[in-house]
């Protein structure tokens, strides 16, 4: 699908002092959706500040956010999911800044989980598998995944592979022998819905076999 901007681009707020960003999570708790907003500047005094969303809601005109420490949060079934909502920072009845946002364009998927790597001796490869709660969802079902892996000693030398399935094969010859690797995965919406990368899954660590001197192949772990 054609897009207008990079995934996750958000509008500037009217007043820089109160600039904020939000992300939505659909069916995050059964059929309930959530919307989370926070100020860009962690030093903003949030004591009397509230967030409100109006428009593109079912049965109600507006909803107020709950404040949870530095973040503002709504969990509801009342998002229409079509049309733009107006999200405002308020002090009492006065709006300080507002953004028109379509909640389907700021979706942040849940992090993948159950990441594992299995070495196949006969095939000389590693099968990477992971799970995602989105396979069971009705809205954000189609995701693009980013698998990142690195040799543990290479601090910032990550190799990334994008895939739409939850299974990836890494060829043994592409990896260093007798090395410890770290691997992790994250997801982003990939059909109709737009938004942000999920949090990374917990990392999984695996060791590649030694090279077998006689055959030039790696020994199994």
């Amino acid at each position: 699908e054609s897009g207008y901007a990079q995934n996750g681009d958000l509008e500037d707020a009217e007043l820089d002092d109160y600039s904020f960003s939000c992300y939505s999570q659909l069916e995050v708790n059964g059929s309930q959706h959530s919307l989370t907003c926070a100020f860009e500047d962690p030093d903003v005094n949030i004591t009397n500040l509230e967030f409100e969303i109006c428009g593109a809601l079912v049965e109600v005109k507006c909803l107020n956010f709950r404040k949870l420490q530095e973040i503002y949060f709504i969990e509801t079934k009342k998002f229409l999911l079509i049309g733009k909502s107006n999200i405002c920072v308020k002090v009492g009845e006065k709006s300080l800044t507002c953004k028109k946002i379509d909640l389907t364009t700021i979706v942040k998927p849940e992090a993948p989980f159950d990441l594992s790597v299995v070495y196949r001796e006969g095939a000389n490869d590693f099968v990477v598998t992971f799970n995602t709660s989105h396979l069971q969802k009705k809205y954000v079902k189609v995701l693009m995944h980013d698998v990142a892996y690195r040799q543990e000693k290479d601090e910032n030398k990550w190799t990334h592979v994008n895939l739409s399935s939850t299974k990836l094969t890494l060829l043994q010859r592409k990896l260093q022998p007798a090395a410890m690797y770290e691997i992790k995965v994250r997801s982003i919406p990939d059909h109709y819905f737009k938004g942000f990368w999920s949090e990374w899954s917990p990392s999984y660590y695996f060791r590649t076999p030694e090279i077998n001197n006689s055959s030039g192949e790696m020994d199994p772990i």
Epitope: E1, A5, D9, K100, D102, K138, Y192
Partner: antibody
Framework: QVQLVQSGAEVKKPGASVKVSCKAS????????LHWVRQAPGQGLEWMGG????????AYNQKFKGKVTLTSDRSTSTVYMELSSLRSEDTAVYYC???????????WGQGTTVTVSS | DIVLTQSPDSLAVSLGERATINCRTS??????????MHWYQQKPGQPPKLLIY???NLESGVPDRFSGSGSETDFTLTISSLQAEDVAVYYC?????????FGGGTKVEIK
């Protein structure tokens, strides 16, 4: 009130270009994407493309890529559609339309008739 | 491209009677309960006017004699009691996939 006002009718020769404007008022210009839809004489509606005035990002119907260029000017709350290499089949009414959501059109300009004739 | 087929091409209905227009799509335009189908009214010499968005949501200011229903590939626009001012061409439009396509239109007249 919310309004989209388009520039006037144009008569052009084949091979020429035309630039149609659409001035928005009554709302914050950067809040909504603006699209262009054409209607050939006696025909239906055809989506050509859209622009996000906030970022300048564009999306085009593949059919019109290379034919249409969309731009916007935030200082005047105006979007422009330029049609190049005009042919007689480009004769149509061209509408700009605001996208109230993804992607339906809740406010329309009055239309600009472009006639291509030698 | 997703093809939208409207039926009938034209419709003559008595004043005060019900008018029903159908729109069938070549593939689903629904994601669960999110139905990406919209309806417009166009009178001669005027731009189209949004009536219904998201299959069943009435646009602000549109009379409630207009209603929409449907899901997946089959959608309906209903005018419950036709008024003289409803004479127009009606178009459906999908927005699940670029390019966003319109139906061919249904002309509604008074019988």
């Amino acid at each position: 009130q919310v309004q989209l006002v388009q520039s006037g009718a144009e008569v052009k020769k084949p091979g020429a270009s035309v630039k149609v404007s659409c001035k928005a008022s009554g709302y914050r210009f950067t809040d909504y994407e603006l699209h262009w839809v054409r209607q050939a004489p006696g025909q239906g509606l055809e989506w050509m493309g859209g622009i996000d005035p906030k970022t300048g990002g564009t999306a085009y119907n593949q059919k019109f890529k290379g034919k249409v260029t969309l731009t916007s000017d935030r200082s005047t709350s105006t979007v422009y559609m330029e049609l190049s290499s005009l042919r007689s089949e480009d004769t149509a009414v061209y509408y700009c339309a605001r996208s109230g959501g993804r992607w339906y059109f809740d406010v329309w300009g009055q239309g600009t008739t472009v006639t291509v004739s030698s | 491209d997703i093809v939208l087929t409207q039926s009938p091409d034209s419709l003559a209905v008595s004043l005060g009677e019900r008018a029903t227009i159908n729109c069938r799509t070549s593939e689903s335009v629904s994601i669960h309960l999110l139905h990406l189908m919209h309806w417009y009214q166009q009178k001669p010499g005027q731009p189209p006017k949004l009536l219904i968005y998201g299959a069943s949501n009435l646009e602000s200011g549109v009379p409630d004699r207009f209603s929409g229903s449907g899901s997946e590939t089959d959608f309906t626009l209903t005018i419950s009691s036709l008024q003289a001012e409803d004479v127009a061409v009606y178009y459906c439009q999908q927005s699940i996939k670029d390019p966003y396509t319109f139906g061919g239109g249904t002309k509604v007249e008074i019988k």
